[in-house]
Each structure stands twice: as C-alpha cells, then as structure tokens.
C-alpha cells in the first residue's frame, strides 16, 4: 500500500515574514512522475504540478493549510504556513514534537536585521539569554519542554517582543509486542 506523502518546508519554518521565500516539497515513496503532484492551499487546487511548490515574496494570503497528493494516493497530512509582519518572529522546527525528537527555536528579526540581547521566555519565565542573537537547540525533547514561548530583543536600539508560540511535546506511542 503506498504511503501518504509528506510535505516538508525549506527553510524548515512554518512561520515566516512577509516577503520571504519558502519551498514546500511533497515527499513520498516511489513517486517517479514529477508532473503528477496536486497541491491544495486552503482546500483549493493549485496550478502547480511539480513535487515542489515555491512561495516567493510571501504575502499574507499565502498563509493557511497546504496538502499535496501524488497520483491517486491519499492526500498528505496538512502543513500550516503563517505569514507575519513584525519586528521579531519566534520560529520553531515543529510546534508538535514527539518526545525524544529534537526541537529547535530561533528568534528571527525582520529583514534579517541584527537582534541584540535576545531573551527566550517559556511560560513567562526567562529561559535563555545572550548578548546577541542565538538559538535554542534541544536534542531530546521531553514533555516538560511543552509550553508557551516567546522572545525579546533589541532592534535598532529599541526593545521588541515576538508573538507567543505554543509548543507541545507528546509522548511517543508505546510499541506493542505480542506473545506468539
């Protein structure tokens, strides 16, 4: 039975700034025909038929749900893209993470401007801080890493704060072993 395809993002962020670029790729098993991909944005069929969908100079209207489909195989699980206009944007490698998987957070400045004295907060408490911009990289996420995150920083000498982002770490499903 062919597997469901999966949509991946490059760069891997599903929250981006207006004007930025992102490529969505429809990955699946043994899909050789490059022109047989269907893309759906908020339920509407896109004109794009390649396995990659390029979003160039993102607009607010590009926000929403994306799904892909190869041939008559099931549609992929949805991926949600959100386009922002702000000074700071907290980006995460994933908003729902399986326990034991990596989690990466980035405090992204508008137009890639330098951000100084970046502080990450989790559930209202300062979590990580440094003189310049920096990231949080958790190798093995645990349920305790679930929470509401945001970042603050200085851009052109002024203090700014990102919108909050909810991160959920879910327990990995237990393998079932059957006695023969």
């Amino acid at each position: 039975v062919p597997q469901k395809p999966k949509v991946s993002l490059n760069p891997p962020w599903n929250r981006i700034f207006k004007g930025e670029n992102v490529t969505l790729t429809c990955n699946g098993n043994n899909f050789f025909e490059v022109s047989s991909t269907k893309w759906f944005h908020n339920g509407s069929l896109s004109e794009e038929t390649n396995s990659s969908l390029n979003i160039v100079n993102a607009k607010f209207e590009d926000s929403g749900e994306y799904k892909c489909q190869h041939q008559q195989v099931n549609e992929s699980e949805p991926v949600y893209l959100e386009v922002f206009s702000d000074w700071l944007l907290l980006q995460a490698s994933a908003e729902v993470v399986m326990e034991g998987q990596p989690l990466f957070l980035r405090c992204h400045g508008w137009r890639n401007w330098d951000v100084y004295k970046v502080i990450y907060y989790k559930d209202g408490e300062a979590l990580k801080y440094w003189y310049e911009n920096h990231n949080i990289s958790i190798t093995n996420a645990t349920v305790e890493d679930s929470g509401t995150y945001y970042c603050t920083g200085k851009v052109w000498q002024l203090d700014y704060e990102s919108e909050p982002l909810n991160i959920t770490v879910i327990k990995a499903p237990r393998e079932k072993y059957w006695l023969q």
């Epitope: 502080i119 440094w130 310049e132």
Partner: antibody
C-alpha cells in the same frame, strides 16, 4: 543562597589529563550560563568559554577552542572544564562564574573561589 | 581578540578620586554597552562592581561610577578608602560569541 563550589587544587604532570568541576546550588542550575575564567600567577583574567546547561550550548574563547572541553551535567548541577593533555603553561587559577539575567542586564554575578591547577614535571 | 588596555597602576590618597581607563576597539567597548568592572582582592575571586557601562549592583557604594566615550570605558572611585586597594578589571562583550577582559589595574591607597 546562590553558591558555586569548585573542586580542590590539583597537581599534575605534563601530558596528563584533568577534569575540574563547579557545582551550582541555590538556584535553577540549567537556566544560567556558567563561564570558565583563567588567571595565571600574577596575571590578569582570561575568558575561556561558557556553557548553557539547559541545551549544552557551548562557546569558547579564541585561544581555548580545541585546547579544553567545557561540559555540564544538569542532573547533578555541575559544570566541568577538561584537558586531555596538560602543559606547564596551563598552571593557573581557574574560576567558574554564573552569567545571569538580572533586571534585563546580562552579568557575571556569582563566582566560585577558584581551583588552582599546577602542572610540573 | 586582544585584552582591553588598562593602566598598570593608579594611586591616590584617602578621600581623593581616581579614574581607571579601559581602551578597546569598535568591535568591543565601542560597539556594545556591555562593559563591566570587577574588583579582585589578593587571593580572592573577582567581584562585580559595575555592569552595562554605568549600572551598580546592590551593595556597591555610589563612590564607584562608570562611563564610556567611544572605544574607552572608565571607572571612577571617588572618596578613595583603604579598602579600595585591589586589582580592578574591565570586561566587554566583543561580538562573535567572545567575551574579553582588560589587562588589570592595581589601585594603591597612599
């Protein structure tokens, strides 16, 4: 009360390995950077590097990358400074210090009492 | 990254003022307002006395003040007292994840 307790003085021969420690107490260890600072006899302070125990983010001073290894074990609230092959020039007092976020400022607010390392044949 | 430059020693009589300079570059002192000052008594660990150029931690007397102009930071001790005799170090964030200390200044109370 915040405390940084460092391991005791060490006397080693050139070529030997060594790992010294700095145990933090009285605060949430994983959420504060720990730096290591060298002071050679009669000389000034040199920033060696720093680690954030929460995610093991580690940064080294330009003269120290590849010469030492900084690590931390957040389960026992301890940071480490390690040499694989000591040299006589490593003889110094080594301080650990906490880099904290205090009212929006990033400062070294607490220091250990230092570990004296003597390397001599 | 070189150490920040401080005078080797300064001295003054009790009650006088002394100023210690700390000269760096646009890449450290001149580029960031993350300049700190530490006092170190012989055989002891350093103690923070000034942060963010001019901030004073609680418990540090207001005789200690910090300032910055261009690539040079300064520490002024007014109303010098015998217990101020110690080594003083400036420090600054220097970009690219590097932190740098000054060469150190010995303050002598005559």
């Amino acid at each position: 009360e915040v405390q940084l307790v460092q391991s005791g003085a060490e006397v080693k021969k050139p070529g030997e390995s060594l790992k010294i420690s700095c145990e933090g107490s009285g605060y949430r260890f994983s959420s504060y950077w720990i730096a290591w600072v060298r002071q050679k006899p009669g000389k000034g302070l040199e920033w060696m590097g720093i680690i954030y125990p929460y995610d093991s983010d580690t940064k080294y001073g330009p003269s120290f990358g590849g010469q030492v290894t900084i690590s931390a074990d957040k389960s026992i609230n301890t940071a480490y400074l390690e040499w694989s092959s000591l040299k006589a020039s490593d003889t110094a007092m080594y301080y650990c210090a906490r880099l904290a976020l205090i009212r929006g400022s990033i400062i070294f607010d607490y220091w250990g009492l230092g570990t004296l390392v003597t390397v001599s044949s | 990254q070189s150490a920040l430059t401080q005078p080797r020693s300064v001295s003054g009589s009790p009650g006088q003022s002394v100023t210690i300079s700390c000269t760096g570059s646009r890449g450290d002192v001149g580029g960031y307002d993350f300049v700190s000052w530490y006092r170190q008594y012989p055989g002891e660990a350093p103690q923070l006395i000034i942060y963010d150029v001019s901030g004073r931690p609680s418990g540090v007397p207001d005789r200690f003040s910090g300032s910055k102009s261009g690539n040079t930071a300064s520490l002024t001790i007014s109303g010098l007292q015998p217990e101020d005799e110690a080594d003083y170090y400036c420090s600054s964030y220097a970009g690219s994840e590097i932190y740098v200390f000054g060469t150190g200044t010995k303050v002598t109370v005559l």
